[in-house]
């Protein structure tokens, strides 16, 4: 019988008492085969973290700073359940740490040196740890003691709870630096008052502070937020302009064998029986013998953290950077305006080989990082392990939802000013063999399908979106008799036609021979009835243009396109017979790397782009024997985006809407994780 006990870790007598009450009340409402609670008492949260790692306990609720400690080796814990605040309809699991300034003050984030600062309190998250952690490498050396470095960075501050004797500048704006509400500038509202009164130039607070202190929109309009990209935004645009997004209070468990499903089952049932306004005799979110025992008193309920989310993703790049800076205190030798090497994310070993060659030729400008799937690469860019990669539009959508930004677009047509003119896009098509003359768009049911990969534009999002509108369900594996759609569940009929061997079967990378445009076309040639690809795929792999044995004798005339009106047309008539226009592939990165990625890639394409004529004796960035490694092989240049610099603007309203509609069919664990952070 599986052990269905969750051993909860308590850190005080009062918590242990509440835990025992929790245990007894759960016993009274949950059947004997359901989850149960046991209580383990430890002296501190860090002891609880160690106990969970050592399998002596299973769960504890922590604030963000401790979630970071819990994630560090050797603990390796992960977030599994989040407390939420506000309403069930609009649950808040995160708050945003922001830098608020007066509208007319005219300086940016990178011009804070010499300004006067207002903090909620020394050592507090939004008011100190996050802003000072992010500014850490700009502080004057020596950076220890930290208070002295901060005092020398700003021209005056109010940092309640600081030592006013040793660091008088930190108390200059609030004499005495009192550590309670007796100090008018203490806490969130106090720090904001410090700004409002004109004592300080910037206040480091939570996003909600401004709304709690200024009910009137006209008053709020006198303030702005400083963004990390050295711009400003209105105070209600905090989701796009903050220092960090911080989880409020989170249950953590072991990463391996951590009972996360059991913990969720327990807490979900607990909130049903003992949540807000549920029971008089025991309340989960109430602490008669103290404050915030086991859970925050202000919590309204629990949400399950998506399984794909590790602590780094949950805490977010900015928060992790800030805390790591404060804890480790390491900075680059001397901050320069020079760009660091761009860490390119390569999929599997074929892309890695090309990336390595690029890296050797780039003379220190490009480094390589490997991952097995596109989603793993996106996750690595999010957390700073990698910086950039070029993505199909479907993944630009996911990357955008995860906070990444497009920076350059692949262009496929030769033109005089290629780099200045991003193209409208390419065509997504459905290709069939000419010999299968009865096949049309209207009778694809039961046929064998070939897709570039799940989640990609031409191979999945466009054809499956159109199909979904017709069949109104997501069971595409039942619609087609079999197929190859790399990235599908291994036991799905949409992996049946794939050719990868062993663990590589149906993998969404080049180890699966039917992956990508060329792979999907090969699948049609060898096994399938229809392939969903781009309009250039057939000409690029016929007429001897692809020398691989399977392709070298193919003739473009032996293939036709399916049109949405039920007719068929020759391959060259794609402009009048396609499924939809698809946005070109684009390079994505984190916002903080945008300028450097842009600069370095433009240099790199001038050295190794399509101006290189002899690819047998030189490195060519846009060539890989029709395998589209790192970039599509038909890329002519990487073009500036001008104002299309967000994923929504880049992909266009129509495509974003189409992918949004397909979301209900999404199997993307990363998309689920990212929409948890930003619904």
């Amino acid at each position: 019988v599986p052990d269905k006990t969750v051993r909860w870790c308590a850190v005080s007598e009062h918590e242990a008492t509440k835990c025992q009450s929790f245990r007894d009340h759960m016993k009274s409402v949950i059947p004997s085969d359901g989850p149960s609670v046991a209580c383990v008492k430890k002296a501190s949260y860090l002891d609880c973290i160690r106990a969970i790692a050592a399998n002596e306990a299973d769960a504890v609720t922590l604030d963000a700073g401790l979630v970071y400690d819990a994630y560090l080796a050797p603990n390796n814990l992960k977030p599994v359940v989040a407390e939420f605040y506000g309403s069930k309809e609009d649950p808040q699991t995160f708050y945003y740490a922001v830098a608020v300034v007066k509208k007319d003050s005219g300086f940016q984030m990178n011009q804070l040196r010499g300004k006067k600062s207002c903090h909620t309190g020394l050592g507090r998250s939004a008011g100190w740890n996050i802003p000072i952690g992010l500014l850490y490498c700009d502080l004057p050396e020596p950076r220890k003691p930290l208070e002295k470095a901060v005092a020398n960075f700003f021209s005056g501050s109010c940092a309640p709870c600081a030592d006013g004797t040793d660091f008088p500048q930190l108390c200059q704006l609030c004499p005495g630096c009192g550590c309670s509400t007796l100090n008018q500038y203490f806490g969130y509202s106090g720090a904001f008052k410090c700004l409002k009164d004109g004592a300080g130039d910037v206040a480091f607070v939570k996003h909600s502070t401004i709304f709690e202190n200024l009910a009137n929109k006209a008053d709020r309009d006198q303030y702005e937020l400083l963004c990390l990209d050295n711009t400003r935004k209105p105070v209600d645009e905090y989701k796009d302009c903050h220092l960090a997004q911080v989880p409020s209070h989170t249950v953590v468990a072991r990463s391996m064998g951590g009972k996360e499903d059991l913990i969720w089952e327990l807490l979900n049932q607990a909130q049903e029986h003992f949540g807000k306004d549920k029971s008089k005799e025991f309340q989960l979110f109430s602490s008669p013998h103290g404050k915030d025992l086991l859970f925050k008193d202000s919590a309204h309920g629990f949400l399950k953290v998506p399984p794909r989310m590790d602590a780094k993703m949950y805490l977010g790049y900015e928060y992790v950077t800030a805390i790591r800076n404060l804890r480790e205190g390491t900075c680059p030798e001397a901050p320069t305006d020079e760009c660091k090497p761009v860490k390119w994310c390569a999929l599997s070993h074929h892309e890695r080989l090309k990336c390595d060659e690029w890296s050797v030729n780039s003379v220190g400008k490009i480094e390589c990082v490997s991952a097995e799937t596109t989603e793993d690469c996106i996750a690595k860019i999010m957390n700073g392990e990698a910086d950039a990669m070029s993505l199909d539009g479907g993944f630009v959508y996911i990357a955008g939802k995860c906070g990444l930004v497009p920076v350059l677009a692949e262009n496929y047509n030769k033109s005089d000013n290629c780099e200045d003119t991003p193209e409208a896009g390419y065509f997504a098509i459905a290709v069939v063999k000419k010999s299968a003359s009865d096949l049309t768009w209207d009778n694809l049911k039961g046929k064998k399908s070939c897709h570039t990969a799940v989640g990609r534009t031409a191979g999945w999002n466009i054809p499956m979106g159109l199909l979904y509108n017709k069949i109104n369900h997501c069971r595409f594996d039942e619609f087609f008799s079999e197929g190859c759609a790399p990235g599908s569940k291994k036991d799905s009929s949409l992996c049946k036609l794939c050719m990868g061997s062993g663990l590589n079967l149906c993998e969404p990378n080049n180890k699966e021979g039917y992956y990508g445009y060329t792979g999907a076309f090969r699948c049609l040639v060898e096994k399938g009835d229809v392939a969903f690809v781009k309009h250039q795929t057939v000409p690029q792999n016929t007429g001897g243009k692809n020398p691989d044995p399977w392709a070298k004798n193919l003739n473009e005339k032996d293939y036709e396109l399916l049109c949405l009106d039920g007719t068929r047309k020759p391959v060259e008539e794609y402009a009048n017979c396609h499924l939809a226009r698809a946005p070109n592939h684009a390079v994505v990165t984190r916002k903080d790397k945008e300028a450097c990625v842009h600069k370095i890639l433009r240099q790199q394409q001038h050295l190794f782009g399509s101006n290189v004529t002899d690819c047998s004796g030189n490195f060519c960035l846009f060539r890989s024997e029709t395998k589209d490694l790192l970039f599509r092989d038909d890329t002519v240049c990487l073009a500036k985006l001008h104002d299309r610099n967000t994923y929504e603007k880049y992909l266009g309203e129509e495509y974003v809407k189409a992918v949004g509609n397909l979301r209900k069919c999404s199997t993307s664990s990363l998309l689920e994780a990212c929409t948890f952070r930003r619904p």
């Epitope: 090309k354 060659e357 490694l629």
Partner: nanobody
Framework: EVQLVECGGGLVQPGGSLRLSCAAS????????MAWYRQAPGQQRELVAG???????KYADSVKGRFTISRDNAKNTLYLQMNSLKPEDTAVYYC???????????WGQGTQVTVSS
Amino acid sequence: EVQLVECGGGLVQPGGSLRLSCAASGSIAGINTMAWYRQAPGQQRELVAGITRSGSTKYADSVKGRFTISRDNAKNTLYLQMNSLKPEDTAVYYCTDYSRGYYQDYWGQGTQVTVSS
């Protein structure tokens, strides 16, 4: 297509040195990029060092300051001088010129380097 044959590996004590050679069956003067990779048991193959025709080089962080890559176009040979060897340098070492493309999984026999006391 140029064939490449690696040699020079062997058993060496920690702190010792080895010089690996990679002899090409034809001219390497026109080959842009050449590189040494290594693969330890149960690990992915990783880039150790690379060199371009113009002589610019790149090294993995783990070997910087200890290993030196060079090429002699007249002798059609690529070299890897390995000093201050450590047990974690134990692996099979391969050379490549990338000319077979990134997709063909063709690698030579390689040469085994074992660093152990």
